[in-house]
Structure formats: C-alpha cells, structure tokens
C-alpha cells in the first residue's frame, strides 16, 4: 500500500531573467527512492538517480542545473517557463509519487500590486 | 473594462459532451491565465484547472482529468472547456475567470454557464 | 489536496456590526520564497463571484476598507469591520499555492 505523500514548495511567481527552485519532499513512507525525474508537460528536464547520479537534458542544459538536494534549480527565466512542472518519485516498493508545482514568470515590468518576486 | 462573455445555459443528455465558450474582451488575453470554476448546488466551488493562452499549457485537477478539456483560440481571444461523458453529477454552474498576475487567483469572472444533465 | 476549513458555516448579522470568518488549511500555505496565495470572495445570489482580498491581506481594486485580511501559514482570518446590506452573502477563501487550488466550504453572512 502507497502511504507516503509528497509536499512541495508550493506555486511560485517570479521575474523574467531570475532564478527559482523547484523542490519536493517525499515523507509517511519507508520505501526507497530510486530515481526522481523532474518533468514540464511532457518534456524531461533532469533525473537525479541513486546510483548514477544527476542528468540534465541536452536541451535544458543551459538553464538547469541540478540540487539542492533532489530539487532544481532553474536560471534564466523566460515567460515561456510558465507552466506546471512535476517531481516524480520512483520507489520501492511502494512505486510512484508524483508532486505538482506551478511557475509563472512576468515580465520585470509587471510588479502587479506591489507582488513580490523572486530573483534568489 | 475586463470582461469575460460566456456562452448560454445547456440542457444536454447523459453521455453526451458539450463545449463551453469564455471569450475575452478588456485586456491582452495572451497575458493572463484563464482558470475554470465549477459551482455545484449552488454553493461548492472547485477549481478544475487553468490555461496558459500564450503557449497552451495547462494545469487540471486531478478530480476533472478526462471530464474537462481545456482549449484556447488566441485570434478570438477565447477560451474554451469540453466536458466529456456528462452525468447527473456534472449537472452545475460553470465559471472562467482570469487569473491575477503572480497571486494565484482569479480577479474577473464570466457570468457562468449552467449545465443541465438530464434525460 | 490541501484541505481548506472555513469557520462558521453560517454568520447571522445585523447591519452595523464587526464579524470575522475563519479559513485554515491542512498544510502551511507559504511557498519556499515566503509567499503566501490565500485569497476571499464574496459571492452573491445572481452574480459572479467578487475578489476581495488577495495574497492574505490586499484589498483588490474597488474593494471598501472595511474588509481586511490577515493571517499567515495555515491560519486565516477575513474581518468586515461595519456590515452593510450590500455584504450579504457566501464568503469563500481560496488557496493557490499548491496543485491543485482549493476553496473552503463557504461562511453565508445573513441577517439575524
């Protein structure tokens, strides 16, 4: 039985050109984490294995980069990055967790109602 | 002035599907989410997912996973929602409304659109 | 899903008086920056539902300053200082900093 549940960092605003982490944490559960894949859409963006380590998509390499922890780290923000990006825990025995953060990224300009955004 | 004109009342059958429009008007449509609300009996509120205009991306709860499809045509700047296989349980009033930038939450809604499902 | 707990389900008023609605939610509702998406409607019969507050305590656009909001993690509060007739309604608050959003169930402002 799958008993463990995932708790992400929560929904983050933030500026076009800035900086934002993407981080889950898996808990309620002794099941072994294997991998964690990070994904938008369907698009992979980076895997971080037990045993081989981090991987980070050709076409992300730029912008990406791996940590902290079984988080990432995504630079150079554009407004294209808005989206939903998911954390997907593979584990055993248990199997598959999956967690949901959304980004949206405004432009410098909109700083609509005094919000305030992230350029960590 | 925001204002988000939505399509009339339905009354359709079980397992027929139906498609809700939202066209905007006011304000750049590529530049705001567009979220979907279902309100059923007259009070629950739940949010069933958000639309991206500029780039389609979307974001569903999981609960409307499969019921609800949400589209957009940006030369028309409008959004739309299909709902697929309709119960008695989707019997309800359907809302879009536009996401607040960097707030996560919704300032201007369309006027709703009730859903009649019955035989 | 983050569960949302609106207190009371009911709030019986006379015009003039001071009442407070309570909304908490099963896990912290500040993201990994500190911010924090919890927002109140009022919705009334025959209407689109109206955006009072937004991002904990901001009055949107046009809202009067007799509503205030104020809380943080998980805890809540909308206060309406001097009721009206025009406040009459189902009061909602909403959280969108976790997939996917919830509202609470709803508080109904009615005359006593």
């Known amino acids: 039985m799958m008993t463990g549940t995932i708790e992400t960092t929560g929904n983050i605003s933030a500026e076009k050109g800035g900086s934002i982490i993407l981080q889950c944490h898996l808990s309620s559960t002794t099941a072994q984490v294997t991998q964690v894949n990070w994904e938008q859409q369907d698009q992979l963006l980076a895997i971080c294995n037990a045993d081989l380590g981090w991987h980070i998509s050709p076409s992300f390499k730029d912008r990406v980069a791996p940590g902290p922890g079984l988080g990432l780290t995504l630079q150079s923000l554009t407004v294209n990055d808005t989206g939903e990006y998911f954390c997907i825990y593979h584990t055993y025995p248990d199997g598959t967790y999956t967690g949901r953060i959304f980004l949206e990224v405004l432009e410098s300009s909109v700083a609509e109602h005094g919000a305030r955004f992230q350029i960590p | 002035e925001v204002q988000l004109q939505q399509s009339g009342p339905e009354l359709v059958k079980p397992g027929a599907s139906m498609k809700i429009s939202c066209k905007a008007s006011?304000?750049?449509?590529?530049?705001?989410?567009m979220n979907w609300v279902k309100q059923s009996h007259g009070k629950n509120l739940e949010w069933i997912g958000l639309?991206?205009?500029?780039?389609?991306?979307?974001s569903y709860n999981q609960k409307f996973k499969g019921k609800a499809t949400l589209t957009v045509d940006k030369s028309s700047s409008t959004a739309y929602m299909d709902l697929l296989s309709l119960t008695s349980e989707d019997s309800a009033v359907y809302y879009c409304?536009?996401?607040?930038?960097?707030?996560?939450?919704?300032?201007?809604w369309g006027h709703g659109t009730s859903v009649t499902v019955s035989s | 899903d983050v569960v949302v707990t609106q207190t009371p389900l009911s709030l019986p008023v006379s015009f003039g008086d001071q009442v407070s609605i309570s909304c908490r939610s099963s896990?912290?509702?500040?993201?990994?920056?500190?911010?924090?998406?919890l927002s109140w409607y009022l919705h009334k019969p025959g209407q689109s539902p109206q955006l009072l507050i937004y991002?904990?305590?901001n009055r949107f656009s046009g809202v009067p300053d007799r509503f205030s909001g104020s809380g943080s993690g998980t805890d809540f509060t909308l206060k309406i200082s001097t009721i009206k007739p025009e406040d009459l309604g189902m009061y909602y608050c909403?959280?969108?900093?976790?997939?996917?959003?919830?509202f609470g169930g709803g508080t109904k402002l009615e005359i006593k």
């Open positions: 409304a536009r996401g607040l930038r960097g707030y996560y939450t919704m300032d201007y």
């Open positions: 006011g304000y750049s449509f590529t530049d705001y989410i």
């Open positions: 639309i991206i205009p500029y780039n389609g991306g979307t």
């Open positions: 896990q912290s509702l500040a993201n990994i920056y500190g911010n924090t998406y």
């Open positions: 991002g904990i305590s």
């Open positions: 909403l959280q969108g900093t976790h997939q996917p959003w919830t």
